[in-house]
């Protein structure tokens, strides 16, 4: 806190300019009018104030706007945004995408800070859903943003927003998140033709059910092994050898290198060894010939 002292004669600030960097903290407190500061916030960013001086300027704004800053001020906070606490930001009502972009720019190149996370949360809640423009903006600044959301939060993403999602945006998503995103992607891309559809849906397939994988196997999609390895194990297990062969196309040879890893390992255990042998890859661990396979889970469901 800076002590309240009278502004020395001739030092009253008439505008926010570089002369203020020569003011001591108490002089800034005494000589800079908070209302003037609020209307000329955009100038602050072009002046090399010390961190201590910025603290004084923030304090002045806090006194002027105890209930939270108006958006006209927020949009021009620039570097001063990094001085804000999550508690400060929770008082704000940010509705403009331009304001959001301006503040994300300040934090560009850094990890998502608690301030930024709070800002995004306030913005999205204010909009009611993650619309395409917002998602475009957020994933441009933070490619991992989508995967930082809970399945519940992801449920508010409209299918139309899925068009903004790039493959790298899903890199850190877990199966529960993809379970929510996949049906939205399927809906968003439903009017595309086979090969184009597969290119778009591929990143989301970690949430695909068995019946959709069976359908894809009929379309000569040539799924790569990296995508196959990210599929849900429970979705892969019911696939036949012929279906997996059609699904992977020329990439089927990659199964050998992955035979000890899920979901390939678990899938092999469910196939007849005879059927696996037809692939000519030397895959071992299938059900020996002559054995009867009882699906106990089906039996339990019936009883």
């Amino acid at each position: 806190e800076v002590e309240k002292t009278a502004c020395p004669s001739g030092k009253k600030a008439r505008e926010i300019d570089e002369s203020l960097i020569f003011y001591k903290k108490w002089e800034l407190e005494a000589c800079v009018d908070a209302a003037l500061l609020a209307t000329q916030m955009d100038r602050v960013n072009a002046i090399p104030f010390t961190y201590e001086q910025l603290d004084v300027l923030k304090h002045k704004l806090d006194e002027l706007y105890p209930q939270g800053y108006p958006e006209s001020v927020i949009q021009h906070l620039g570097y001063l945004f990094l001085k804000m606490s999550p508690e400060d930001i929770r008082k704000w009502n940010v509705t403009s995408l331009e304001t959001l972009k301006a503040l994300l720019e300040v934090n560009k190149g850094h990890e998502m800070s608690p301030q930024v996370a709070t800002l995004i949360d306030r913005f999205v809640k204010g909009r009611g859903q993650l619309d395409k423009d917002t998602l475009d903006t957020l994933t441009a600044f933070y490619p991992g943003y989508l995967c930082s959301l809970s399945p519940e939060e992801l449920s508010s993403v409209p299918p139309s927003s899925i068009w903004a999602v790039r493959p790298q945006d899903l890199d850190t998503c877990d199966p529960r998140q993809l379970d929510v995103l996949y049906p939205k992607a399927r809906l968003a891309f439903q009017n595309m033709n086979g090969s184009e559809y597969f290119v778009k849906i591929q990143s989301f397939l970690g949430g695909a059910p068995t019946e959709d994988l069976k359908a894809l196997s009929q379309q000569n999609v040539s799924m790569d092994l990296a995508t196959f390895m990210k599929l849900r194990t429970d979705a892969v297990l019911p696939l036949t050898v012929a279906e997996v062969q059609k699904l992977l196309g020329p990439h089927v040879e990659g199964l050998k290198a992955e035979e000890r890893h899920r979901p390939v390992r678990d899938w092999i255990l469910r196939q007849r060894q005879d059927d696996l042998d037809t692939l000519g890859l030397g895959l071992q661990g299938g059900i020996p010939n002559g054995y009867l396979v009882l699906d106990l889970s089906m039996q339990e469901a019936l009883s």
Epitope: E18, D42, N45, A46, I47, P48, F49, T50, G78, Y79, A102, E105, V106, K108
Partner: nanobody, 117 residues
Amino acid sequence: LQLVESGGGLVQPGGSLRLSCAASGFTLDYYAIGWFRQAPGKEREGVSYISSSGGSTNYADSVKGRFTISRDNAKNTVYLQMNSLKPEDTGVYSCAAAGGYSNSSRYWGQGTSVTVS
């Protein structure tokens, strides 16, 4: 991305020093630069300022007529020429850059020590 100051040292009263503030990893063209100093146990104070274009300069009253700030954008460096040094000019001098292309970036150097004795 950082600012690196150099040129400090020990000098007798009345002597001169030329401090440099060089940008590493980014270009200074769009940035306004300020020189600051901090004496032991005292508040950091602004010494000099130069606009991004170099067309505008400003100085603290205590150094006017003795210090001159300049910039060489080709060398990505800002200079502070200090003449007629006094014991009260002693302190750690650091430079700060503000503005940038998006007008929202800010960098600080670690400082260089100046002793007038």
